[in-house]
């Protein structure tokens, strides 16, 4: 699927538009909101009943080049004895992201976009139950 | 996309960091991945922290529809179906990566930007410190 | 480190009315919610209101609502409990709660006495 065009009746193409050549977009890689800090809670993913730890993923050719993924620590919950249940289970909690792709083929360099699922953290859920015949 | 020369052996050796501004296709990689929570798992309503889902729409940035989860409750489900209150409901937040229409409303000129979506819940236990 | 300074707690009649507030200072940032519990002696602390802080969604034990009512005050750090048609049930000592998701701090306490 391409990025939509602007289809809004109310939107009018601005004159000030940059001229792009056809099947492409110019993308600005320096990011708006960089510098946020982010005040995320302390050591949620170790006091969580279902917790998690993060691994780092590093690639040279993708935009970030470094991308946090989650792993849930068990199959069940820690209960409040602080012992597994696993009569429930620890599920992963997932987000889209956008990243640009560098591609090389040859003695050239061209850029995609790539959507990539990440994994934030983990939940604990009540299972659905089946009984098999 | 459009495409530059690279290293090495090639002219106009190109430097490893990424350029202010690339041309970029069109097309995105992996574009089908389902981008609607509520129907790639009823993990919102099963968990013991669930949360409910919002859809936060803005034409000026890719993707337009974004889904927010605000945790449903204070406190966390327990085995009889009550909310305990000596546990909390926390939003998992994550920073996500989206295209700004820059300048806005051009239809193919875009800029990245850094966004903080709830995307989820968690049940955690809280250390308790009684004040003095 | 937090503090948390408790008032407005005493002795009403049955119907009445009493304003509980806790003010909330320190290093008490990240707030999550901020609420009340309540014990009477030999019982457990139960829950009895709460306010999450990013957005004032309130939640409620089924025994106070429609007749407590929890607000707070961002600027100072402070919630409040307004508590109207009181009923000797409701006599406890009554816990400001501050949690900030992964620490939850607890204030002393305040004696309110509902009685004829």
């Known amino acids: 699927r391409k990025i939509p065009k602007v289809g809004h009746t109310f939107f009018q193409k601005p004159e000030s538009c940059p001229p792009v050549p056809g099947g492409s977009m110019k993308l600005d890689i320096g990011i708006i909101n960089e510098n946020q800090r982010v005040s995320m809670s302390r050591n949620i993913e170790s006091r969580s009943t279902s917790p998690w730890n993060y691994t780092v993923t590093w690639d040279p050719n993708r935009y970030p080049s470094e991308v946090v993924q989650a792993q849930c620590r068990n199959l069940g919950c820690i209960n409040a004895q602080g012992k597994e249940d696993i009569s429930m289970n620890s599920v992963p909690i997932q987000q889209e992201t956008l990243v640009v792709r560098r591609k090389h083929q040859g003695c050239s360099v061209s850029f995609q976009l790539e959507k990539v699922l990440v994994t934030v953290g983990c939940t604990c859920v009540t299972p659905v139950i089946h009984h098999v015949q | 996309g459009i495409t530059i020369p690279r290293n090495p052996g090639c002219p106009n050796s190109e430097d490893k960091n990424f350029p202010r501004t690339v041309m970029v296709n069109l097309n995105i990689h992996n574009r089908n991945t389902n981008t609607n929570p509520k129907r790639s798992s009823d993990y919102y309503n099963r968990s013991t922290s669930p949360w409910n889902l919002h859809r936060n729409e803005d034409p000026e940035r890719y993707p337009s529809v974004i889904w927010e989860a605000k945790c449903r409750h204070l406190g966390c489900i327990n085995a009889d179906g009550n909310v305990d209150y000596h546990m909390n409901s926390v939003p998992i937040q994550q920073e996500i990566l989206v295209l700004r229409r820059e300048p806005p409303h051009c239809p193919n000129s875009f800029r990245l930007e850094k966004i903080l979506v709830s995307v989820g819940c968690t049940c955690v236990t809280p250390i308790v410190h009684h004040v003095a | 480190e937090v503090q948390l300074v408790e008032s407005g707690g005493g002795s009403v009649q049955p119907g009445g009315s009493l304003r509980l507030s806790c003010a909330a200072s320190?290093?008490?940032?990240?707030?999550?919610?901020f609420g009340w519990f309540r014990q009477t002696p030999g019982k457990e602390r139960e829950f009895v209101a709460g306010?999450?802080?990013?957005?004032?969604?309130?939640e409620y034990a089924n025994s106070v609502k429609g007749r407590f009512t929890i607000s707070r005050d961002n600027s100072k750090n402070t919630v409040y409990l307004q508590m109207d048609s009181l009923r000797p049930e409701d006599t406890a000592v009554y816990y400001c709660?501050?949690?900030?998701?992964?620490?939850?701090?607890w204030g002393q306490g305040t004696l309110v006495t509902v009685s004829s």
């Open positions: 709660v501050l949690d900030l998701s992964t620490v939850r701090y």
């Open positions: 306010i999450r802080w990013s957005d004032a969604y309130t």
């Open positions: 320190g290093r008490a940032n990240s707030i999550n919610w």
